[in-house]
């Protein structure tokens, strides 16, 4: 979050939309008058592309220059200075920087430990003083016995058959965030957690190896939930929800074999585990766990470049990267990206000025820092603009950890850019075995929702703002991210074809850039989210006789999809009898298309309280998941099932439907209110 | 209703072997570290093995080591006890028992099977 | 292996009376992991005490175990015809193997 309260020289933010200030990029002697068309566009793309060195690039951010570079370390400084500088060589329309004063959390001098204690807390023996750690950890020294709960979701803790209140967790990394591991933890009133690697999950030969990572469920600086801190705005001191309030630990494998010594019981066959895996301590012995973790303030600075739309500047895809990385591990986890954002940027930079692309809508393209610690960077820009950025971005294409092998390309999307992805995966050939990104005409069963860790999560379940991120990489997990193993040799010896695996993802995210920034019909599938209703309503209509009992209908929320299904229908149609060449009926029909996403954000909380207001992609009880789980409630366990909180879910969610259906449908004329 | 269900028992000659079976139900077999406990007529209790809820760990006492062999098939829910080299102080009533409290190897025994006989004679 | 020596081997009391049983072990046995049984004719043994002094579930409060070291001792506050039987105590904390004590009879005066 932002503090206005630095020196003049202070650069000011969010000027995209300043066109007058603006230079348009220079060009060569160049046709103006012919209009590039797609293949062209794309064959342009292509050859650019094959004279890019992506790897060189990758190598020279992963070398010590520029590492290790923590969220507002001085490396992270000069590399955002770096990446600024290659911006104004691109001549870009404009070139900012965003500067913010955020709370980190970082290791104090004073060692986190992990001991064995008998059963009168008389030391045993140190397992550990690890050198990792996990940001936003409580501080605090916990003793209790010692329950592993295999990776932490809620179904591992259903199948535990033993209760974890008053006790230590211990969890395999993988699977779902650290943050969502301790926050299952917690709400079992478990004591602590302690996070290690098992080697059949993360197959590294120096079992001390430590590693880091962040345990806020949330994104952005968790002591200003869901708001920036500019001083005008005096907000009172803030934390946020997603804060855990038991200390949590990264331990090596080879700290958590020394506690399997200590402990009883076989873990489960199905888990698939190492063979030392125990599940609980002896009842002579207890572990203690000390965290003394400490915040600091830090400045952090995203880097900006735009080049600005020929016909709508004042509409812009949002391009970016994580830049910094904890620990000393930097190539995956943020080099990969960060080069890729420099070199499109250079090759869109070389195709206005050179080749004569003229994008009708702006591309930003955005170095974000602070990303190890929940994508603090990203939100904050966002949390500070999120009135500016609202009918303006429309699409956040992420290019964190886009290559971690090399088997498999997997998507995580919201649902209006599936056709648009379905498309270009038809285009783009995987470098190794020569055929087509689209292996699967059921490819979209399989995306999986964006993950609190992302930086595209935030764009979509707190801005509203359809967002895409894809990577190529294998079934099991890169095993070297969050650790000083995150090298660019490990990365090469993982991923042989990396130069070739790059451009691969740079011809991805080259064609998404311009296909939503020069057709002159928004790229952007509004009727997908009628599938996306319609799976929500078959879910609800299982429990019909419930929803019966309690004396209500489902009848509005039908009535609600119909709605969003005719306006959508109604939207084609005129999209179909619109005139192509008339540019203000087309911005009119695609601004229709730009409140889609951002009116699936429930009008109905706070964004102070629950910032990730979408209802299908968001995080809290308005959203449509939240109702189910809530449903599922009743007749499972009568005693959890809240009826109260039912009723006002039903209410919202219908309301919040029928309020996107008419968004869609246009002008306040154009709505059918006959609901 | 927690069940453990000793069968296999009989008459058998020294030297010769018996399999005991114990058929669990009413809990999650494969949570609970499992024992064979034995009693001679009219003396006391005498732990003969344990294995632990995987199968990955077991042990006997001193007096059938190398003779008899605990297993345990948690797909079946059942436990148990392969008795070779059989002799006349073999002879029991057996129990099989499930540790009281799920994972943990060392820990009393909660749940007990009414026993099987295993009378061993010539 | 660990010995187990109860003591008395036979109990005479009346309902109501307190109970006092012991048991003493060859070596330190870590009070985590000493339990005591009860046995009634004809019956399979039933938990009564695990870790020395936690009571199992459904085990009345009369019932209660104390002790560490080499040193432990099941008490019955007040007797119960119920509580007529043979009493045994387990040590399971060494490396097995495990062992139970002799057990001790506590029987009507």
């Known amino acids: 979050c932002k503090r206005v309260e630095q020196k003049e020289e202070c650069v000011k933010l969010a000027e995209t939309e300043e066109t007058d200030k603006s230079e348009t990029m220079e060009t060569e002697d160049v046709p103006t008058s012919s209009r590039l068309y797609w293949a062209d566009l794309k064959t342009l793309l292509s050859e650019k592309l094959n004279s890019i060195e992506f790897a060189d690039t990758i190598k020279q951010l992963s070398q010590n220059t520029y590492t290790p570079r923590e969220a507002g370390s001085q490396k992270d400084e000069s590399l955002a200075y770096y990446i600024e500088n290659q911006f104004h060589e691109f001549k870009f329309s404009k070139v900012w920087r965003d500067e913010h004063y955020v709370k980190i959390q970082v290791k104090d001098s004073a060692q986190n430990s992990v001991i064995i204690v008998d059963k009168n807390g008389r030391l045993v023996y140190l397992v550990e003083n690890p050198g990792g750690y996990v940001a936003y950890s409580k501080a605090a020294t916990v003793t209790g016995k010692l329950v592993h709960a295999n990776f932490g979701t809620k179904k591992d803790f259903e199948d535990l058959y033993t209760p974890v209140n008053g006790s230590i967790v211990i969890v395999r990394a993988g699977k779902i965030t650290f943050a969502e591991k301790v926050a299952n933890a917690e709400s079992l009133n478990a004591i602590g957690v302690l996070i290690y690697m098992d080697q059949t999950k993360f197959p590294i030969v120096n079992a001390e190896l430590s590693f880091f990572g962040h345990a806020h469920l949330g994104t952005g600086d968790p002591y200003t939930p869901g708001f920036p801190s500019f001083n005008h705005t005096q907000f009172p001191p803030s934390r946020s929800s997603g804060l855990p309030n038991i200390p949590v630990q990264t331990i090596s494998r080879a700290a958590a074999e020394k506690l399997f010594g200590n402990m009883e019981g076989d873990c489960p066959s199905d888990w698939k585990t190492d063979s030392t895996c125990r599940m609980v301590t002896s009842e002579s012995k207890n572990v203690k766990l000390t965290v003394s973790n400490v915040l600091k303030e830090r400045r952090i600075l995203n880097i900006f470049g735009v080049i600005k739309g020929y016909e709508e500047p004042d509409r812009y895809v949002v391009v970016g990267a994580q830049r910094d990385a904890l620990g000393a591990g930097v190539a995956a986890k943020s080099s990969v990206g960060t080069g890729l954002l420099l070199k499109l940027a250079q090759v869109f930079s070389d195709m206005i000025s050179k080749d004569g692309f003229r994008p009708s809508r702006s591309i930003i393209f955005a170095s974000w820092t602070a990303g190890d610690f929940g994508a603090v960077g990203a939100t904050e820009w966002l949390e500070g603009y999120l009135s500016s950025l609202h009918l303006k971005a429309f699409t956040y294409i992420n290019l964190d950890k886009v290559v971690l092998g090399t088997s498999n390309f997997k998507v995580s999307a919201s649902p209006l850019l599936y056709t648009l992805m379905g498309k270009i995966m038809q285009d783009v050939k995987h470098p190794v075995d020569g055929k087509s990104l689209y292996r699967d005409s059921n490819w979209i069963s399989k995306v999986e929702k964006l993950s609190f860790d992302n930086a595209a999560y935030p764009f979509l379940a707190y801005s509203g703002i359809p967002a895409v991120s894809f990577c190529f990489c294998e079934d099991a997990d890169y095993p070297y991210l969050g650790t000083r193993l995150d090298t660019y040799e490990a990365l090469t010896q993982k991923v042989p074809q990396l130069n070739q695996m790059v451009r691969t993802a740079a011809e991805v995210a080259g064609q998404l850039i311009i296909k939503l920034t020069h057709d002159v019909e928004l790229n952007l599938d509004y009727e997908r989210y009628n599938s996306q209703l319609l799976s929500f309503v078959r879910d609800l209509n299982q429990y019909r006789a419930d929803i019966k009992e309690m004396g209500l209908s489902l009848q509005w929320l039908y009535s609600a999809r119909g709605d969003f299904f005719r306006a959508t229908s109604r939207l084609t149609t005129d999209f179909g009898n619109a005139e192509k060449t008339d540019r203000f009926v087309m911005k009119k029909l695609n601004d229709r298309v730009m409140r889609v996403e951002y009116h699936f954000l429930s009008p109905y909380v706070s964004p102070k309280e629950s910032p990730f207001r979408h209802v299908f992609w968001g995080s809290g009880s308005h959203t449509l998941p939240a109702l189910l789980e809530n449903l599922k409630l009743r007749k499972q366990n009568n005693g959890a099932f809240n009826e109260t909180l039912f009723r006002n879910q039903l209410a919202l969610a219908t309301w919040t439907i029928q309020g996107a259906a008419n968004a869609l449908s246009g002008d306040v004329w154009d709505i059918d209110n006959e609901f | 209703e927690v069940q453990l269900v000793e069968t296999g028992g009989g008459l058998v000659q020294p030297g010769g072997s018996l399999r005991l079976s114990c058929a669990a139900s009413?809990?999650?077999?494969?949570?609970?570290?499992m024992n064979w406990v034995r009693q001679a007529p009219g003396k006391g209790l005498e732990w003969v093995s344990v294995?632990?809820?995987?199968?990955?760990?077991?042990d006997y006492a001193d007096s059938v080591k190398g003779r008899f062999t605990v297993s345990r098939d948690n797909s079946k829910n059942t436990l148990y006890l392969q008795m070779n080299s059989l002799r006349a102080e073999d002879m029991a009533t057996y129990y099989c028992?499930?540790?009281?409290?799920?994972?943990?190897?060392?820990?009393?025994?909660?749940?007990w099977g009414q026993g099987t006989m295993v009378t061993v004679s010539s | 292996e660990i010995v187990l020596t109860q003591s008395p081997g036979t109990l005479s009391l009346s309902p109501g009376e307190r109970a006092t049983l012991s048991c003493r072990a060859s070596q330190s046995v870590s009070s985590s992991y000493l339990a005591w049984y009860q046995q009634k004719p004809g019956q399979a043994p039933r938990l009564l005490i695990y870790?020395?002094?936690s009571r199992a579930t459904g085990i009345p409060d009369r019932f209660s175990g104390s002790g560490s070291g080499t040193d432990f001792t099941l008490t019955i506050s007040r007797l119960e015809p119920e509580d007529f039987a043979v009493y045994y105590c387990?040590?399971?904390?060494?490396?097995?193997?495990?062992?139970f004590g002799q057990g001790t009879k506590v029987e009507i005066k």
């Open positions: 387990q040590q399971y904390g060494s490396s097995p193997p495990w062992t």
């Open positions: 009413g809990f999650s077999f494969d949570k609970y570290t």
């Open positions: 028992a499930r540790a009281s409290q799920p994972w943990l190897y060392r820990t009393g025994a909660d749940v």
């Open positions: 294995i632990s809820n995987g199968g990955v760990s077991t």
């Open positions: 870790g020395a002094s």
